[in-house]
């Protein structure tokens, strides 16, 4: 038996740094969708009511408690009749997979904020990305949310060669040894080693010494 006409399918959570959107199929014809998400009291909260989109931004709900495991469902209604129901007296609906933001949100591509050379040492700083998670009316950074669960890996190499070295840190800073007179290039990756899925971000854009971001001091 196929999916009944109008019923949503392929419900998928798309989440990066806690910005979280539920997507589904198909594009509606003669019907609309309404999304519900279960809150921490296990009540269903209505979102994106009567939409003809096939996505719904649920960020403002999931950031209330990023450690909570959420479930959503997409309800289908004939166009212009939000009261219309299926044969069992309920609207057609499809449940999403469960989603735990802290464990599953993708780590966004990090950015190298700066690097500074002092003699044969280079200090590399990773930008502490702001998330949409709030506490006490302020937005928390990625580090604020993940704490020591989040590490960064630095890949660095001489501009004149391809041999990469790595360093890791539990903060947003690295301090690496370099050869004097050599230019180096850098890229960083965010990692949550304790995760089973979505453990690593994509690599940051490469930054090289001799370009804008760096500073050199004898």
């Amino acid at each position: 038996a196929g999916t009944p006409p109008g019923k949503a399918f392929n419900l998928t959570w798309i989440s990066t740094d806690f910005k979280t959107i539920l997507e589904w199929q198909p594009k509606p014809t003669n019907y609309t969708y309404t999304v519900q998400i279960s809150d921490r009291s296990r009540n269903w909260k209505y979102k994106c009511t009567g939409t003809t989109d096939t996505e719904c931004d649920l960020t403002d709900e999931i950031v209330k408690d990023v450690n909570w495991t959420y479930e959503a469902r997409v309800l289908s209604y004939p166009a212009g009749n939000v009261e219309s129901t299926g044969s069992a007296g309920e609207p057609l609906y499809e449940n999403s997979p469960e989603f735990t933001p802290y464990l599953e949100t993708n780590l966004g591509q990090p950015t190298i904020q700066s690097f500074e050379q002092v003699g044969t040492k280079v200090n590399v700083t990773v930008e502490d990305e702001r998330t949409l998670v709030r506490r006490n009316n302020t937005f928390l950074s990625l580090r604020d949310v993940f704490g020591k669960d989040l590490i960064y890996t630095l890949y660095y190499w001489k501009s004149s060669s391809s041999g990469k070295k790595t360093a890791k840190t539990n903060t947003n800073e690295f301090l690496i040894d370099v050869d004097k007179g050599e230019n180096y290039c850098f890229s960083v990756q965010a990692v949550i080693p304790s995760r089973t899925v979505n453990r690593k971000s994509t690599d940051s854009p490469v930054e090289c010494m001799g370009q804008e971001k760096g500073e050199f001091r004898e």
């Epitope: 506490r135 993940f146 630095l154 800073e173 690496i176």
Partner: antibody, heavy 125, light 108 residues
């Protein structure tokens, strides 16, 4: 120089909640360190209970997680431990500690470098 | 959890002698997260070594740490009277952070 001081009742009845506070002096609790609780049963080794960042991000020992809450009050420069449903097995010296970043191998890693003197908590009726 | 086993449980030595303390992990530990602490009776532990081999500021150079993977060692090259205490290794890379059971270095 950062100093830590634990405070709280030395005697707690079984099934009640143990509550301790650690006051940080000589530095800000919001300055990028983590703040930990560790305990030591009489004549025994050390057991890590959990830690908190100034933002409220926590990590707990799974063996105690269902009973432990660690919180932070940045306005008072304090962090606190609550351990519920205590039994005699929770009798121990409780230490608070600072987890600060140290340079190693190209990066920075956290180690417990400043400890309070410890406070003895006895669970007994 | 990672279990750290320290041996021997007690080490009886005289001042001036060399002390070698062992810490063995049940699974591989990243050296970046391995520390050694000293604890004297009635006192809180004190950080001696971090990153398996780096001395904390103010720690005398008679203390040295080494090792990687599952086997780590703390060496006190010449015991001073103030070194008689209990020593703990600790890993802080995997939750729960764990301590070894301790080695007591006592005066012979």
């Amino acid at each position: 120089q950062v100093q830590l001081q634990e405070s709280g009742p030395g005697l707690v009845k079984p099934s009640q909640t143990l509550s301790l506070t650690c006051t940080v002096s000589g530095g800000s609790i919001s300055s990028g360190q983590y703040w930990s609780w560790i305990r030591q049963h009489p004549g025994k080794g050390l057991e890590w209970i959990g830690e908190i960042y100034y933002s409220g991000s926590t990590r707990y020992n799974p063996s105690l997680k269902s009973r432990v809450t660690i919180s932070v009050d940045t306005s008072k420069n304090q962090f606190s431990l609550k351990l519920s449903s205590v039994t005699a097995a929770d009798t121990a010296v409780y230490y608070c500690a600072r987890d600060a970043p140290y340079y190693y191998g190209g990066g920075y890693y956290y180690y417990m470098d400043v400890w309070g003197k410890g406070t003895t908590v006895t669970v007994s009726s | 959890e990672i279990v750290l086993t320290q041996s021997p449980g007690t080490l009886s030595l005289s001042p001036g002698e060399r002390a070698t303390l062992s810490c063995r992990a049940s699974e591989s530990v990243d050296s970046s997260y391995l520390a050694w602490y000293q604890q004297k009776p009635g006192q809180a532990p004190r950080l001696l070594i971090y990153g398996a081999s780096t001395r904390q500021t103010g720690i005398p150079d008679r203390f040295s740490g080494s090792g990687s993977g599952t086997d780590f060692t703390l060496t006190i090259s010449r015991l001073e009277p103030e070194d008689f205490a209990v020593y703990y290794c600790q890993q802080a890379g995997v939750v729960p952070y764990t301590f070894g059971g301790g080695t007591k270095v006592e005066i012979k």
